[in-house]
Amino acid sequence: MAVTACQGLGFVVSLIGIAGIIAATCMDQWSTQDLYNNPVTAVFNYQGLWRSCVRESSGFTECRGYFTLLGLPAMLQAVRALMIVGIVLGAIGLLVSIFALKCIRIGSMEDSAKANMTLTSGIMFIVSGLCAIAGVSVFANMLVTNFWMSTANMYTGMGGMVQTVQTRYTFGAALFVGWVAGGLTLIGGVMMCIACRGLAPEETNYKAVSYHASGHSVAYKPGGFKASTGFGSNTKNKKIYDGGARTEDEVQSYPSKHDYV
């Protein structure tokens, strides 16, 4: 029961985590710029992995996708890659874990197969969570170091003058969503790995045979049961362990009028 609960909870936690990673990847608020007042109205800038947006105090919002793939910083490309890898691994992990759930019966799937699938999905969730955490952390480091920023300077560009304005970018909501989601996926993965240990059937290297002292009247009981004396207090006849799904104590024989000669 505890194994099923752990596996089920791990699945749900991972599901929430992966949904969060997807949400964070799609969000525009990875970095936000503090509100500043221009001569007209307050303008609020924010950027995501895919596009940059500007919102005015009037409510007007405009977003534009990043123009080129080759011109983007390597760090941004790396963050995109990490998030996408995290989503793909997480999605595959979810698919595998659905079939691995103990509460779902698919054909005559062995417990060992379910255990292996649970472990696989658990590892996938762990890697997925780590990818998301790494991606978000790399982006956060980009913001902290302000690698693209120089001090306010002026230079002549093509057809006019260009001035770089010193601005301060802060962590956007997507970063926190990503960190939490990555953590949840990681926790879910660990729970799946723990559940896997409980799912794996324990190997036994012996045959469970009951030995009894021979009595006066010994009867042969068909169906794989050992002989039993009519005198002993031990009336439970044990079935020889055949490596099947049933345990030793599952099949028991109780005395009947046919047991005695």
Partner: nanobody, 121 residues
Framework: EVQLVESGGGLVQPGGSLRLSCAAS????????MGWYRQAPGKGLELVAT???????NYQGNLKGRFIISGDNSKDTLYLQMNSLRAEDTAVYYC???????????????WGQGTLVTVSS
């Protein structure tokens, strides 16, 4: 690289009209606001008018009735319609774009090369 190309300047008689335009091209991301500044001979740079992408406008005090600033968001083009021109409006007019590149390059102010408007009889 972003380029601003101005056009529409020239010689006009007092009381006449002119329409300046400024087309932005290149890798433009989030335009925060656009505007026109002017520099009269021997004087400093002064604000004429600014406009946001949302259409909020701001004019230098005594120009509001005569000058109209507008923009075409789809073409990234800025316009300045100047009516009832006076001799004191003679200046080099510069268009200005504040573009936010965010993580790709921060906040940058771009200025055009300037177009000369001469009001003379």
């Amino acid at each position: 690289e972003v380029q601003l190309v101005e056009s529409g300047g020239g010689l006009v008689q007092p009381g006449g009209s002119l329409r300046l335009s400024c087309a932005a091209s290149g890798n433009i991301l989030s335009i925060n606001y656009m505007g026109w500044y002017r520099q009269a001979p021997g004087k400093g740079l002064e604000l004429v008018a600014t406009i946001t992408r949302g259409g909020s406008t701001n004019y230098q005090g005594n120009l509001k009735g005569r000058f109209i600033i507008s923009g075409d968001n789809s073409k990234d083009t800025l316009y300045l319609q100047m009516n009832s021109l006076r001799a004191e409006d003679t200046a080099v007019y510069y268009c200005y774009f504040r573009i936010n590149f965010g993580i790709l390059g921060g906040l940058r102010d771009y200025w055009g090369q300037g177009t000369l408007v001469t009001v003379s009889s």
